[in-house]
Interface confidence: medium
Amino acid sequence: EINGSANYEMFIFHNGGVQILCKYPDIVQQFKMQLLKGGQILCDLTKTKGSGNTVSIKSLKFCHSQLSNNSVSFFLYNLDRSHANYYFCNLSIFDPPPFKVTLTGGYLHIYESQLCCQLK
């Protein structure tokens, strides 16, 4: 298991919410991506190959997410100060073999300007 800080902008704020970007290499065909808050699994998405050109995307812990050919974005809404924490992208690579797990993360700072429902 490889642990490290994300070497890219992991948090993108908009409209009182945050997009958490979890990247993976383009070569990866089948994988599971989990979003961890501290040690707690918030979201997951699994992509697997099926018959012919079919692909299966499944989530056991569902969050609004977006999949591209080299990243999974998880969206958290209605930010408040309790969202401030360490967030990790836990990537399990199934294909190509060998099986590998990588963990990258960063700290989500919450500032007044990013809160969803600021008191005026």
């Epitope: 099926g50 050109n53 079919t54 692909v55 299966s56 499944k58 199934f94 294909d95 190509p96």
Partner: antibody, heavy 124, light 108 residues
Framework: EVQLVESGGGVVRPGGSLRLSCVAS????????MSWVRQAPGKGLEWVSG????????DYSDSVKGRFTISRDNAKNSLYLQMNSLRAEDTALYYC?????????????????WGQGILVTVSS | EIVLTQSPGTLSLSPGERATLSCRAS???????LAWYQQKRGQAPRLLIY???SRATGIPDRFSGDGSGTDFTLSISRLEPEDFAVYYC?????????FGPGTKVDIK
């Protein structure tokens, strides 16, 4: 024990239609993609069509594209193959088969469980 | 589409002998997405090997697979009476999935 049981085969005239069904038991059906594979009498195996776990993605061999439709009903643990505009060359034993994910990972391989097959004969 | 060619077409051997079956692909099968199946008369195919070399659950260790790219082999170290059957290789890398024409292993 995983069991796949096909039904709906029979004799049909060229240009006719048939709907094959495959009922699965002993398995969490919606965990898996499924396929139809056929075998003409005395010949080899031919992959026909595949569908992912929730029916949201399908694929077909060129020989049946536009004529056959694969679908599934997870509530009924059932897989279907609607066959239209049938031709003599579609005569075969049709198997439903389950996609498999290797132990300890999701490394994909078809097909670890097969039905016993159902015969479709297209003849005038 | 990827065309698979199997050789020999028929292999006549005695129980206890070693069988080596070949499967050649018309283009590279990436990530070793190649499987082997055994089919006996009147029965559905049975998965033996996936990922070119991984044995499926319950398959005896006398069956082994090897190869990568375009050349793959299935070996049966000591033929048992129940091993006489037709063997198909199968690529599941590119759509449409394709099977080889089969190798029949029969008793000499």
């Amino acid at each position: 024990e995983v069991q796949l049981v096909e039904s709906g085969g029979g004799v049909v005239r060229p240009g006719g239609s048939l709907r094959l069904s495959c009922v699965a038991s002993g398995v969490t059906f919606d965990d898996y993609g499924m396929s139809w594979v056929r075998q003409a009498p005395g010949k080899g195996l031919e992959w026909v069509s595949g569908i992912n776990w929730n029916g949201g993605d399908t694929d077909y061999s060129d020989s049946v594209k536009g004529r056959f439709t694969i679908s599934r009903d997870n509530a009924k643990n059932s897989l279907y193959l609607q066959m239209n505009s049938l031709r003599a060359e579609d005569t075969a034993l049709y198997y439903c088969a389950r996609d498999f994910y290797g132990s300890g990972s999701y490394y994909h391989v078809p097909f670890d469980y097969w039905g016993q097959g159902i015969l479709v004969t297209v003849s005038s | 589409e990827i065309v698979l060619t199997q050789s020999p077409g028929t292999l006549s051997l005695s129980p206890g002998e070693r069988a080596t079956l070949s499967c050649r692909a018309s283009q590279s099968v990436s990530r070793s997405y190649l499987a082997w199946y055994q089919q006996k008369r009147g029965q559905a195919p049975r998965l033996l090997i996936y990922g070119a070399s991984s044995r499926a659950t319950g398959i005896p260790d006398r069956f082994s697979g090897d190869g990568s790219g375009t050349d793959f082999t299935l070996s049966i170290s000591r033929l048992e009476p129940e091993d006489f059957a037709v063997y198909y290789c199968h690529q599941y890398d590119m759509s449409p999935f394709t099977f080889g024409p089969g190798t029949k292993v029969d008793i000499k």
